[in-house]
């Protein structure tokens, strides 16, 4: 089978900048190394939010930098994007390659846009 | 370069002018009068590495990132081999997509 | 990869079809190179342009079968033109499409 990668349409983000979503592949091969990407796309520039490489049956690590976390499960991979503000807002893009072992799969989902709403400040208490 | 059958030699690809260590890079060669033939790949990190069968067992990609140095390692070279090898940068976000490419170096295999 | 090679006039419009034994999805790439010259990188991703491409050159398919069109030939046109899969190793070219002028 053809390697596919899905992910939902529309997230909108939490109140704390917080946004999650799921990125599922379908694999055409037994990999056990894949590597995971969050690109943004905006106005037609793609910037390279995130990656990550795994082992199947591990967990996802990102860099201790990262603004992205995420867990795994089969070919099921949970990311979560934080520090989210306003101007984030944009197309994300989940990029999935099969790493190893040989062939090399490429697999790219069609996006979710994240909203991004920033909070109204609190009115001043007397 | 002119080798003979059977024997080595190494290919060394100096990049310039980008952030090398953050991309990956692929070889390519053509034939005389022939096509495109992908050959090999190499991660930016030099993590991972995939390549064409027809080279597989007797060519290794490598690279030195503290030298920006892209390295082809041919080995029992063959009549067939004979091509210019071009080394291409893979595309910051798409690897497999060659974006800038060298000028070629031709290697001659003949006895 | 077809045709191999065609002959056409300033002006023209060209179109160049390559079909992949397998479904790709949309990970195909088109290279330009002209003789004793190093090849250029025009489309990626079946249709997007890369930075300095004139807009006369699309591309377009999904799955197995994609084309490039150049809408009006220009005289710097003249060249061979390649496609390429990014899908999976090994990431195969096409046998090329030599654009000559008639």
């Known amino acids: 089978k053809a390697m596919h990668v899905a992910q939902p349409a529309v997230v909108l983000a939490s109140s704390r900048g917080i946004a999650s979503f799921v990125c599922e592949y379908a694999s055409p091969g037994k990999a056990t190394e894949v590597r995971v990407t969050v690109l943004r796309q905006a106005d037609s520039q793609v910037t390279e939010v995130c990656a990550a490489t795994y082992m199947m049956g591990n967990e996802l690590t990102f860099l201790d930098d990262s603004i992205c976390t995420g867990t795994s499960s089969g070919n099921q991979v949970n990311l979560t994007i934080q520090g989210l503000r306003a101007m984030d807002t944009g197309l994300y893009i989940c990029k999935v390659e099969l790493m190893y072992p040989p062939p090399y799969y490429l697999g790219i989902g069609n996006g979710t846009q994240i909203y991004v709403i920033d909070p109204e400040p609190c009115p001043d208490s007397d | 370069g002119v080798v003979q059958p059977g024997r080595s030699l190494r290919l060394s690809c100096a990049a310039s002018g980008f952030t090398f260590s953050s991309y990956g890079m692929h070889w390519v060669r053509q034939a005389p009068g022939k096509g495109l033939e992908w050959v090999a790949v190499?991660?930016?990190?030099?993590?991972?590495?995939y390549y064409a069968d027809s080279v597989k067992g007797r060519f290794t990609i490598s690279r030195d990132n503290s030298k920006n140095t892209l390295y082809l390692q041919m080995n029992s070279l063959r009549a067939e081999d004979t091509a210019v090898y071009y080394c291409a940068r893979g595309a910051r976000i798409i690897t497999p997509c060659m974006d800038v490419w060298g000028q070629g170096t031709t290697v001659t295999v003949s006895s | 990869q077809s045709p191999s090679s065609l002959s056409a006039s300033v002006g023209d419009r060209v179109t160049i079809t390559c079909r992949a034994s397998?479904?790709?999805?949309?990970?195909l790439i088109w290279y330009q190179q002209k003789p004793g010259k190093a090849p250029n990188f025009l489309i990626s991703?079946?249709?997007i342009l890369q930075s300095g491409v004139p807009s006369r050159f699309r591309g377009s398919g999904s799955g197995t079968n994609f084309t490039l069109t150049i809408n009006s030939l220009h005289p710097e046109d003249f060249a061979t033109y390649y496609c390429q899969q990014s899908y999976s190793t090994p990431f195969t070219f096409g046998p090329g499409t030599k654009v000559d002028i008639k």
């Open positions: 190499i991660w930016y990190d030099g993590s991972n590495k």
């Open positions: 397998q479904s790709i999805n949309t990970y």
């Open positions: 991703a079946t249709s």
